[in-house]
């Protein structure tokens, strides 16, 4: 019987390190191996027939037990499979390894309206494009860390908000008087330090009734 | 034959360091990552992390971050682990093994002992 | 962390009878268990891998079975050189040891 497997199916790695993505098979006599690399919609050949492609030729080397990177970039995070079969036979066999580029978050960028209807919906985003794994996200009123379900803590106990870790998104639906503070974001992927956004203040106004 | 060659027992003070060698011979050194693994007195093995001597990439069991350094010199086909500020729980044989996908040849182990 | 628990930690048996030393592991290995034996002076010797494949060289009185999370390796027809301590890998992630066997020969 052939197999192919690899003992670290998943493979963490600082920016601009080398890197090895194992792939180790038997059962095969005249193995032909093959990487592939999908990330969201792409999908590129790292190697072919035993050999790197040409758009990786410059820093990929091509191992009989996996393939090596001289260096990555957070564009090479994603899935690469290695498939192996038997040159003129039906054997074959496959196995995956998730690659994850490690890129600390960047300083987030925060959209907060400076003042907002009490009463009305008010949306505030937090978002940082570097981090790898992607950053997840926590709001800040005046300092003091606001809790996913505001019902969870006194002092957010009067606010009706959803806050999203992972798109950091923070919706007050409706807005309340006692919202009325200073809104800051963090940002945290588990590598390198988290990041802190400017602090931008937010006034609840009262709707503006017409004579 | 393949063959992996470690360096000669070692003796050593609390708070000093120690370099461990690993001369491979009888196959490509650039092909296969090398191992290295720790026996304490009494108990099993474990792994301490492994180095691609191709492009010197590393990878370390969490346990042994910032106390071991794996480096390789490959026109001497020779691995190295240094291990820093020693102390008496860092006492134990140390084994470089090649790895396939299991670890098909070993070392004949290093003994560290840690010793004021 | 896949954890791998062996047993027994010892065991003592006469020359030409069998033993058997199990291993499991604390998730499904996908028969991703090697074993080995290791004797004192010397590294671990590689004598099966993927769960019953024997490496080059080893006899046929060292055999390995076993699916899931439990493993078993057996030595049939013991003779005095297999004394030693057995440990069982698991490789199919990252890589784990078992705490060891311990053989004599009565």
């Known amino acids: 019987s052939v197999t192919v497997h690899s003992s670290e199916p998943e493979v963490r790695i600082p920016e601009n390190n080398p890197v090895k993505l194992s792939c180790a098979y038997s059962g095969f006599s005249s193995p032909r191996v093959e990487w592939k690399f999908d990330q969201g919609d792409t999908t590129r050949l790292v190697c072919y027939n035993n050999k790197i492609t040409a758009s990786y030729e410059d820093r990929v080397t091509f191992l009989p037990t996996g393939i090596t990177f001289k260096s990555v970039t957070r564009e090479d995070t994603g899935t690469y499979t290695c498939m192996v079969s038997e040159e003129g036979g039906n054997s074959y066999g496959e196995v995956k390894v998730k690659l994850i580029v490690l890129v600390p978050p960047s300083k987030p960028t925060v959209n907060i309206p400076s003042s907002a209807t009490i009463g009305n919906r008010a949306v505030l985003t937090c978002s940082e494009q570097d981090g790898s794994p992607p950053s997840e996200y926590t709001w800040f009123k005046d300092g003091i860390v606001m809790p996913t379900n505001p019902k969870s803590t006194r002092a957010f106990s009067n606010s009706s908000y959803v806050l999203n870790p992972t798109t950091g998104e923070l919706v007050f639906d409706p807005l309340s008087a006692s919202d009325t503070g200073e809104y800051s974001c963090e940002a945290r992927n588990g590598y390198g330090t988290p990041m802190t956004s400017n602090a931008v203040r937010m006034e609840a106004v009262e709707r503006n009734v017409g004579v | 034959e393949i063959q992996l060659q470690q360096s000669g027992p070692e003796l050593v003070k609390p708070g000093a360091s120690v370099k461990v060698s690993c001369k491979a011979s009888g196959y490509s050194f650039t092909d296969y990552s090398m191992y290295w693994v720790k026996q304490s007195h009494g108990k099993s093995l474990e792994w301490i992390g492994y180095?691609?001597?191709?492009?010197?990439?590393?990878r370390y069991n969490q346990k042994f971050k910032g106390k071991a350094t794996l480096t390789v010199d490959k026109s001497s086909s020779t691995a190295f682990m240094h291990l820093n500020s020693l102390t008496s729980e860092d006492s134990a044989v140390y084994y470089c093994a090649r790895q396939t996908d299991y670890f098909d040849y070993w070392g004949q182990g290093t003994t560290l002992t840690v010793s004021s | 962390d896949i954890q791998m628990t062996q047993s027994p930690s010892s065991l003592s048996a006469s020359l030409g009878g069998k033993v058997t030393i199990t291993c499991k592991a604390s998730q499904d290995i996908n028969n991703y268990i090697a074993w080995y034996q290791h004797k004192p002076g010397k590294g671990p010797r590689l004598l099966i891998h993927?769960?019953?494949t024997l490496q080059a060289g080893i006899p046929s009185r060292f055999s390995g079975s076993g699916s899931g999370r439990d493993y078993s390796f057996s030595i049939s027809n013991l003779e005095p050189e297999d004394i030693g301590t057995y440990y069982c890998?698991?490789?199919?992630?990252?890589?784990?040891f078992g705490g060891g066997t311990k053989l004599e020969i009565k």
């Open positions: 993927y769960t019953s």
């Open positions: 180095i691609d001597p191709y492009n010197g990439g590393t």
């Open positions: 890998l698991q490789y199919d992630n990252l890589w784990t």
